[in-house]
C-alpha cells in the first residue's frame, strides 16, 4: 500500500466525513511537527510529543467514527512512522534507550 501523502482531505468544503481522510489529516499534522526536527528523530524527548499527539488524533477520530482503537488503519500509520522516522534509530543510544513499548514494535494501546 502507498505511504501517506500530504493531500488535502475534505477539499470540497466541510470536514472530512470518513476515518480514512481523518487519518490523513492526523498524518499531515504529524508530518508538519516532525519534518523540522529531522535531526532529532531518534531523541524520544523531542519526538514523544508529536508522536503521542498523532496517537490521540487517530484514537479521537476512531471514536468519532465508532471504530475501535487500535484498528488496522491506525496500526498501519503507526507502523509507517516507525519505518519512516525511527528505522535508523539504535535502541542503545542514550537518548532513545527507553522508548515506549509500541516504538519497540508492539502496537498495543499504551499510556504516556
Amino acid at each position: 500500500q502507498p505511504l501517506p501523502t500530504t493531500g488535502t482531505p475534505g477539499s470540497e468544503g466541510g470536514t472530512v466525513k470518513n476515518y480514512e481522510t481523518a487519518v490523513q489529516f492526523c498524518w499531515n499534522h504529524y508530518k508538519d511537527q516532525m519534518d523540522p526536527i529531522e535531526k532529532d528523530w531518534c531523541d524520544w524527548a523531542m519526538i514523544s510529543r508529536p508522536y503521542s499527539t498523532l496517537r490521540d488524533c487517530l484514537e479521537h477520530f476512531a471514536e468519532l467514527f465508532d471504530l475501535g482503537f487500535p484498528n488496522p488503519l491506525a496500526e498501519r500509520i503507526i507502523f509507517e512512522t516507525h519505518q519512516i522516522h525511527f528505522a535508523n534509530c539504535s535502541l542503545v543510544q542514550p537518548t532513545f534507550s527507553d522508548p515506549p513499548e509500541d516504538v519497540r514494535g508492539s502496537h498495543h494501546h499504551h499510556h504516556h
Epitope: 470536514t15 504529524y30 499527539t53 488524533c57 484514537e59 479521537h60 494501546h109
Partner: antibody
C-alpha cells in the same frame, strides 16, 4: 449531559487558584477533549487548554497559558485548571467545555474569577 | 495552533435582510471549524460545525461555508433574536480544539 464549574473566587494578585469541572451524564473518553475557555468582562472568548479524554492524558495549551496554567483529569468525570501568579488580566468567567473535532458541544454556565487587591 | 481573524464588529442588518461574517485561519484547518452565537449573560451556543453542518435545533437561515483557511457565516431572513455576538473557532488542528476568533457583533435594525 452537562458540565459545571466550581472554584471561582475573588483573589489577590500573585495568588493561585484551582477550578474544578464536574461532568454529569457522561464520563471522559477518547471521543472528547475537555477544555477550559475564558471570557473577560465585555471581551471575547479565549481558549486556554484542553486535555484528551482518552487514556493518554495529553494536554494542549494556548501559547500564552503554558507554564502558568495546568489542566488535569482527576477522575473520569472531573477536570481541574490550576492557575498561578494571577493578575488582574486573568479576571474573567471561566467555562469548562466538552469538545470534539466538530466543535464545542457542551458548555458549562461558567465560574467567575476576580483578581483584585 | 491556528490564529483566527474575524470580521470586525459591528455588522448591521435589517429585519428580513442578510448579513455575512467572515473568518480567516492562519493555517489550513480543512473543515475543522465551528461557528457560535452568544447572547449577553449566556454561554455560547454551537451553530455550525464541520464548517457547513447545522447544529441541532438551529434554523436553516444560518449557513456556513468554506474550507481550508477561509470561512463564512451567512444569516438570511434576519430576526431581532439574531442580534448577538458570533464567534468562529478552529475546532481541531490535528492536536486539539483551539483558537477562537475575536467575535463579531451583529446588530439588527
Amino acid at each position: 449531559q452537562s458540565v459545571e464549574e466550581s472554584g471561582g473566587d475573588l483573589v489577590k494578585p500573585g495568588a493561585s487558584l484551582t477550578l474544578t469541572c464536574t461532568a454529569s451524564g457522561f464520563s471522559f473518553s477518547s471521543r472528547y477533549y475537555m477544555c477550559w475557555v475564558r471570557q473577560a468582562p465585555g471581551k471575547g472568548l479565549e481558549w486556554i487548554a484542553c486535555i484528551f479524554g482518552g487514556s493518554s492524558d495529553n494536554s494542549y495549551y494556548a501559547r500564552w497559558a503554558k507554564g502558568r496554567f495546568t489542566i488535569s483529569k482527576t477522575s473520569s468525570t472531573t477536570v481541574t485548571l490550576r492557575m498561578t501568579s494571577l493578575t488582574a488580566a486573568d479576571t474573567a468567567t471561566y467555562f469548562c467545555v466538552r469538545s470534539d473535532a466538530w466543535g464545542v458541544n457542551l458548555w458549562g454556565p461558567g465560574t467567575l474569577v476576580t483578581v483584585s487587591s | 495552533a491556528a490564529v483566527m481573524t474575524q470580521t470586525p464588529s459591528p455588522v448591521s442588518g435589517v429585519v428580513g435582510g442578510t448579513v455575512t461574517i467572515k473568518c480567516q485561519a492562519s493555517q489550513s484547518i480543512y473543515g475543522y471549524f465551528s461557528w457560535y452565537q452568544q447572547k449577553p449573560g449566556q454561554p455560547p451556543k454551537l451553530l455550525i460545525y464541520s464548517a457547513s453542518d447545522l447544529a441541532s435545533g438551529v434554523p436553516s437561515r444560518f449557513k456556513g461555508s468554506g474550507s481550508g483557511t477561509q470561512f463564512t457565516l451567512t444569516i438570511s431572513d434576519l430576526e431581532c433574536a439574531d442580534a448577538a455576538t458570533y464567534y468562529c473557532q478552529c475546532s481541531y488542528d490535528g492536536s486539539s480544539p483551539n483558537a477562537f476568533g475575536g467575535g463579531t457583533e451583529v446588530v439588527v435594525k
